[in-house]
């Protein structure tokens, strides 16, 4: 049998059995999520589950820009360093930066300091770039 | 109120040179990324350079067509964005507009306020 | 990458017109669409920034939106006025690349 890869949609970028678009646009972390599920196909702010999809991720993302900090679906809903991927994937990767979590820092960014490899918290209300995930 | 303010436009030969200025004021102009774009007698909008904030660097862009010949600056004492035009050609010729960002964040981008333009006429 | 508008487009006073610009690569939404119009012998003026915000003083019978499947934005005027009669642009970016559309000329017979 052929197997066929399956297709993103136009512009987005495809990953093992997963479509990515980054948002080159500003929005805070929930409407940046509002926007991912504006796309159907069970979209969310994007999981990041292992060193070579962050990898591959920074990669695409440092073709475009290497300066500004990209939302992911990692956040802190109720407020005490619980997090959870927006998705509902299983938090067991993580690649956190050295940086104190403290403060009303509840939702996770990928940072541009490391190339976008690691990850920081920031106040959820700032408007960034951001990064969303399906399956097709 | 946001002002910005075009001058340095006249007639130059082809092969000159030509320096254009645009004083700004009403806002916080260090804090901003600016640029210039360009309209040929008759033609479209057509962007041509654009500088971030130091604050952001001061990263300067240029339209390919530009490139080696243009070079954009600010002096932020001064409220001033500049644009240097070496080796003009006739298809330089149109009024140059500077554009101020819209957001102080996400730096040469989009433009919320644009100049009344200085008129660059290049021929012999 | 390129931002195609038509040309011109033509409608009667009171009436609603739909300006289109289309991308034709990569996807439309994944970057900022904006609008400015240009009188004659005027400067361009934004009528709409982020796809879809109207600038303070910008009349609400302006609106900007996206749609992926087609890729392209959209400036609608509802209610015309003589007074919309001018050139209309679009503008995005990518990178460090920024791009305006060629322009509609709007006619308001």
């Known amino acids: 049998d052929i197997i066929m890869r399956p297709s993103c949609a136009p512009g987005w970028f495809y990953h093992k059995s997963n479509c990515y678009g980054y948002f080159r646009k500003l929005r805070n972390w929930s409407d940046a999520e509002l926007e991912c599920q504006s796309y159907g196909n069970g979209a969310h702010l994007a999981s990041i589950l292992s060193l070579k999809e962050a990898s591959t991720i920074a990669e695409y993302i440092s073709g475009y820009q290497r300066s500004q900090p990209i939302w992911i679906g990692l956040h802190d809903p109720q407020k005490r360093q619980q997090w959870q991927w927006i998705d509902g994937a299983m938090y067991l990767y993580r690649s956190w930066s050295g940086k104190s979590m403290g403060g009303n820092k509840h939702c996770a960014e990928m940072s541009s300091n490391n190339n976008f490899l690691t990850w920081s918290s920031n106040e959820c209300n700032k408007r960034q770039h951001f990064l969303c995930k399906y399956r097709p | 109120e946001v002002q910005l303010v075009e001058s340095g436009g006249g007639l130059v030969q082809p092969g000159g040179s030509l320096r254009l200025s645009c004083e700004a004021s009403?806002?916080?102009?260090?804090?901003?990324?600016m640029s210039w774009v360009r309209q040929a007698p008759g033609k479209g909008l057509e962007w041509v350079s654009s500088?971030?904030?130091?604050?952001?660097?001061?990263?300067?862009y240029h339209a390919d067509y530009v490139e080696g010949r243009f070079t954009i600056s600010r002096d932020d004492a001064k409220n001033t964005l500049y644009l240097q035009m070496n080796s003009l050609r006739a298809e330089d010729t149109a009024v140059y507009y500077c554009?101020?960002?819209?957001?102080?964040?996400?730096?040469?981008?989009?433009?919320?306020?644009w100049g009344r333009g200085t008129l660059v006429t290049v021929s012999s | 990458f390129m931002l195609t508008q038509p040309h011109s487009v033509s409608e009667s006073p009171g009436k609603t017109v739909t300006i289109s610009c289309t991308r034709n690569?990569?996807?439309?939404?994944?970057?900022?669409v904006q609008w400015f119009q240009q009188r004659p012998g005027s400067s361009p003026t934004t009528v709409i920034y982020?796809?879809?915000?109207?600038p303070s003083g910008v009349p609400d019978r302006f609106s900007g939106s996206i749609d992926s499947s087609s890729n392209s934005a959209s400036l609608t005027i509802s209610g015309l006025k003589t007074e919309d009669e001018a050139d209309y642009y679009c503008?995005?970016?990518?990178?460090?690349?920024?791009?305006f559309g060629g322009g509609t000329k709007l006619t308001v017979l």
């Open positions: 554009a101020k960002d819209w957001s102080a964040y996400d730096s040469v981008h989009l433009f919320d306020y």
């Open positions: 009403g806002f916080s102009f260090s804090s901003y990324g």
């Open positions: 500088i971030t904030s130091r604050g952001r660097g001061g990263s300067t």
């Open positions: 690569t990569d996807n439309i939404a994944f970057n900022y």
């Open positions: 982020e796809d879809n915000q109207r």
């Open positions: 503008q995005s970016y990518d990178g460090n690349n920024l791009v």
